[in-house]
């Protein structure tokens, strides 16, 4: 598989690695989300490991307000992180692809 | 870096690998998109390599109708593919996480 295809596989499998632990096996509850963020996206969380920070992240992702994060909400979240990474990428002249 | 962080890096770097070839270096034109899909997501395209198929994909991705695909539109596209992969994942009992 090509790197981009593998990346999509990782996105799917990582979600299910945590969503399958408690409650609805196709959704992340707060405990599962906390574990996913702490273990799989430590650079995103940084030092914000207090309970209120997790509650805020959860609330921001949970667009249908069911106290869980479904796969679509998770994808929107990852897209937001990717867009933040992209802004950083575009802002670094040494990392940019050659000028057209 | 953790696999999910690497996956996000791949998403960003793959976009710029192709967007940097012609025209606006932060957007994919039709030629760049065609090359990205053919080389990086061959399993998505399958046998649909005719011009009409590419036009249809381009039209679906280009939500702001500027005949180019920006990073946000590309993320929406990848989210859609991930969601299709996820539906397949959820539909395969042998691939599912354990029942809760």
């Amino acid at each position: 598989a090509r790197p981009l295809e593998e990346a999509l596989d990782v996105i799917v499998s990582t979600f299910h690695k945590y969503s399958g632990k408690e409650g609805d096996k196709f959704k992340l509850n707060k405990t599962e989300l906390k574990e996913l963020l702490t273990r799989e996206l430590p650079s995103f969380l940084g030092k914000r490991t207090d309970e209120a920070a997790f509650q805020k992240v959860m609330s921001n992702l949970d667009s249908n307000r069911d106290n869980e994060v479904d796969f679509q909400e998770y994808c929107v979240f990852l897209s937001c992180i990717a867009m933040m990474c992209n802004e950083f990428f575009e802002g670094c002249p040494d990392k940019e692809p050659r000028k057209k | 870096a953790r696999p999910l962080e690497e996956a996000l890096d791949v998403i960003v770097s793959t976009f710029h690998k192709y967007s940097g070839k012609e025209g606006d270096k932060f957007k994919l034109n039709k030629t760049e998109l065609k090359e990205l899909l053919t080389r990086e997501l061959p399993s998505f395209l399958g046998k649909r390599t005719d011009e009409a198929a590419f036009q249809k994909v381009m039209s679906n991705l280009d939500s702001n109708r500027d005949n180019e695909v920006d990073f946000q539109e590309y993320c929406v596209f990848l989210s859609c593919i991930a969601m299709m992969c996820n539906e397949f994942f959820e539909g395969c009992p042998d691939k599912e996480p354990r029942k809760k």
């Epitope: 707060k30 609330s59 921001n60 106290n67 | -």
Partner: antibody, heavy 120, light 107 residues
């Protein structure tokens, strides 16, 4: 201290549109909260109308959805409600509330409420 | 929609009494149950969220319990300022729904 203040006409004619605005002070429209409308009928029953939140995400009560419109103006720290084709059954005290990000998303701050009477 | 049923609809009690109000949901709400107190002419005030967590500034005589579909609000020793109407509300899913209220009156 967070304060919410509803404003709008107290009397609306049947078939017209009810328009209310809520002004938030002591807190800005951060992405951490959803901003709600709830009404209380003369018989004291409470009904959730809808809310607006993160990234402008809006959810409406399905029973009102086809008559409802909500928006926000972050520069003024305000959010608004429009309910069209009103009838006497829409007579109620209308509250704006803040929805906390804690488990169960409780309504932790409320405006004092504004009575809207639908009558010709 | 999830239906919320409160009982009793009203009760009479004296200062110092232990008061219990129950709330039943039409389906499992996974402890996402909030309680509010309302006094005449005023807006409701949050008392407890997520079944048993006390909102800031709320006296410890208020407590909550329950799981699944059945929940309880308890006032361990009723005070003069506690005479009011109490509402439960589910935060499990949209649309949010409230119980019909329980009016606590002076005996």
């Amino acid at each position: 201290q967070v304060q919410l203040q509803e404003s709008g006409p107290g009397l609306v004619k049947p078939s017209q549109t009810l328009s209310l605005t809520c002004t938030v002070s002591g807190d800005s429209f951060t992405n951490d909260y959803y901003w709600n409308w709830i009404r209380q009928f003369p018989g004291k029953g409470l009904e959730w109308i809808g809310h607006i939140g993160y990234g402008g995400n809006i959810n409406y009560n399905p029973s009102l959805k086809n008559r409802l419109s909500m928006s926000r103006d972050t520069s003024k720290n305000q959010f608004s409600l429009k309910l069209s084709s009103v009838t006497a059954a829409d007579t109620a005290v209308y509250y704006c509330t803040r929805e906390s990000f804690y488990d169960g998303y409780p309504f932790d701050y409320w405006g004092q409420g504004t009575l809207v009477t639908v009558s010709s | 929609d999830i239906q919320m049923t409160q009982s009793p609809s009203s009760l009479s009690a004296s200062v110092g009494d232990r008061v219990t109000i129950t709330c039943r949901a039409s389906q499992d709400i996974r402890n996402y149950l909030n309680w509010y107190q309302q006094k005449p002419g005023k807006a409701p005030k949050l008392l407890l969220y997520y079944t048993s967590r006390l909102h800031s500034g709320v006296p410890s005589r208020f407590s909550g319990s329950g799981s699944g579909t059945d929940y309880t609000l308890t006032i361990s020793s009723l005070q003069p300022e506690d005479f009011a109407t109490y509402y439960c509300q589910q935060g499990n899913s949209l649309p949010r729904t409230f119980g019909g209220g329980t009016k606590v009156e002076i005996k």
